[in-house]
């Protein structure tokens, strides 16, 4: 959560001289209440817009728009405080519109916009617009709030934003999974045009439980340039337990722009559909959630071995 370049912030419009200031999110009118305060904003709208910078970057922004109520309190409106709270981190960022001239009623309803809060993919925010001065402690509230959910990098128009491209959003691995004989699974995917390593993670579950019963990680070494956009194949040997049959495969790239935080792509292979009589799970078989095996996870493509060190992937 951040602001686009401060020097560009403008809030003046015809009939109003206005400046945008940084705010501590604690306006002076909280500490020194005023007797006469304006009414609350009307029709607060938050939309996903995109800012093109002169450097060629593209950032998702929260476009905040609201109008004024057509009452006499417009005469006491000195500005507005815009607050954006990122819900998962409680990080808050505020700016203040400071009106340098008095507002007058005119033929059109006053409308204000602000689009300089840069937001992150797949995050939820609470956006609040407070009219200033804020009300006295027992006064009617003069703010409006709305939640705003930013789509993730899978969203059609988020893919080409700078933060999404930095995390590898343009790479389409087109993962395919094939079940082979002898408890084996072949995973195939398209390499991106960068010489960086990949990790393929297999986690298996029983059909009825969401506890992992098997876990393997395999490394793919950085491809050479002639291998870019080619298919890579990895073969896993699966758990010997037939009920450990619901497989979740993730491919994690390590692109230079995102390192350990690149977008992972996943596919799920459900258990095969068996006739009406489902085979019961042997209780004894199920005691270990995963089968400890020794071994390193550094294996090349098509090497059957793999580490089963247990990992949790979010």
């Amino acid at each position: 959560l951040r602001l686009l370049d401060h020097r560009a912030l403008v809030c003046s419009q015809p009939g109003l001289n206005c400046t945008v200031k940084n705010s501590t999110c604690l306006d002076d009118s909280w500490i020194h209440p005023r007797n006469l305060t304006p009414s609350s904003p009307k029709d607060l709208q938050i939309q996903l817009h995109f800012a093109h910078t002169q450097q060629g970057d593209l950032f998702p922004v929260a476009h905040i728009e609201w109008t004024l109520q057509t009452d006499a309190s417009i005469l006491y409106l000195e500005g507005a405080e815009l607050s954006v709270l990122q819900l998962n981190t409680n990080e808050r960022l505020c700016v203040r519109f400071e009106f340098l001239s008095k507002l007058r009623h005119h033929h059109r309803r006053w409308r204000f916009t602000f689009s300089h809060f840069v937001v992150d993919p797949d995050q939820e925010y609470e956006v609040t617009v407070h009219h200033l001065p804020k009300p006295i402690p027992d006064g009617d509230p003069n703010h409006q709030s709305k939640n705003f959910l930013v789509p993730d990098c899978e969203h059609a128009r988020m893919k080409v934003t700078t933060p999404c491209m930095s995390s590898g959003s343009l790479w389409d691995p087109n993962i395919t999974v094939e079940t082979l004989e002898a408890h084996q699974l072949r995973v195939s995917f398209t390499l991106w045009n960068e010489s960086t390593p990949y990790q393929v993670l297999l986690e298996s579950f029983s059909d009825s439980e969401n506890h992992s019963c098997f876990d393997v990680v395999k490394q793919i070494f950085a491809p050479r340039q002639e291998e870019f956009h080619q298919r890579a194949n990895v073969t896993f040997t699966l758990s010997k337990f037939h009920w450990c049959c619901h497989h979740h495969v993730q491919v994690q790239p390590f692109f230079s722009s995102c390192l350990n935080d690149c977008l992972r792509h996943a596919v799920t292979v459900p258990c095969p559909v068996i006739s009406n009589t489902t085979v019961p799970k042997p209780v004894a078989d199920y005691i270990p959630l995963w089968e400890p095996r020794s071994g390193s996870s550094d294996y090349k493509d098509d090497d059957d071995k793999g580490s089963s060190h247990h990992h949790h992937h979010h």
Epitope: A8, V10, Q47, F50, H52, T113, A156, V160
Partner: antibody
Amino acid sequence: QVQLQESGPGLVKPSETLSLTCTVSGGSISNYYWNWIRQSPGKGLEWIGDIYYSGSTNYNPSLKSRVTISVDTSKNQFSLKLSSVTTADTAVYYCARDGELANYYGSGSYQFYYYYGMDVWGQGTTVTVSS
Amino acid sequence: DILMTQSPSSLSASVGDRVTITCRASQGIRNDLGWYQQKPGKAPKRLIYAASSLQSGVPSRFSGSGSGTEFTLTISSLQPEDFATYYCLQHNSNPFTFGPGTKVDIK
């Protein structure tokens, strides 16, 4: 006012490649997405794919193996190629723009856009696949 | 792919009637939905974007509402020029998909 105009052959033989061009006039190709949509006779609308002005593409998976969309910013044009056509590809083909420059006070030194689906369309060109 | 369904598939109405068309998405699409009007031999024309915002130049008798999976287009007082086919479009995820259309004709 931006206008779009599709051009290309109206008749294509089965197994050949359909090629169409959309010329953008009255505005820039930059910062927008450019789409191809088709409508088979008496049928609904089907999105074929799009291209961002920078060249990044999205294709409909049902056509992906046969479709190529490209952009030429110097000519203010973008193009569609559909290979191995059959009679099922007979349709009216439309090009369309996705994206609008946000026109509001206080934008400063940035250009703000929003992308809410196709707002400007060409008038469409009929392509018949027949031997 | 996100499947868009529209109801009704066709309706007959008179000038002055209030008309409501519903569009449902097979999964949540936020407010990434537009409504389009198409007349025979013409390209579609956008009426509503972002589920509820009126396209510039479109009469205010058209309105849109909804979010997530259920959306509505309302024509408050049907005019002679409104007899056409109406489509919804989701542009949340690729591939973009249109509803099958609702044909509005004269009763």
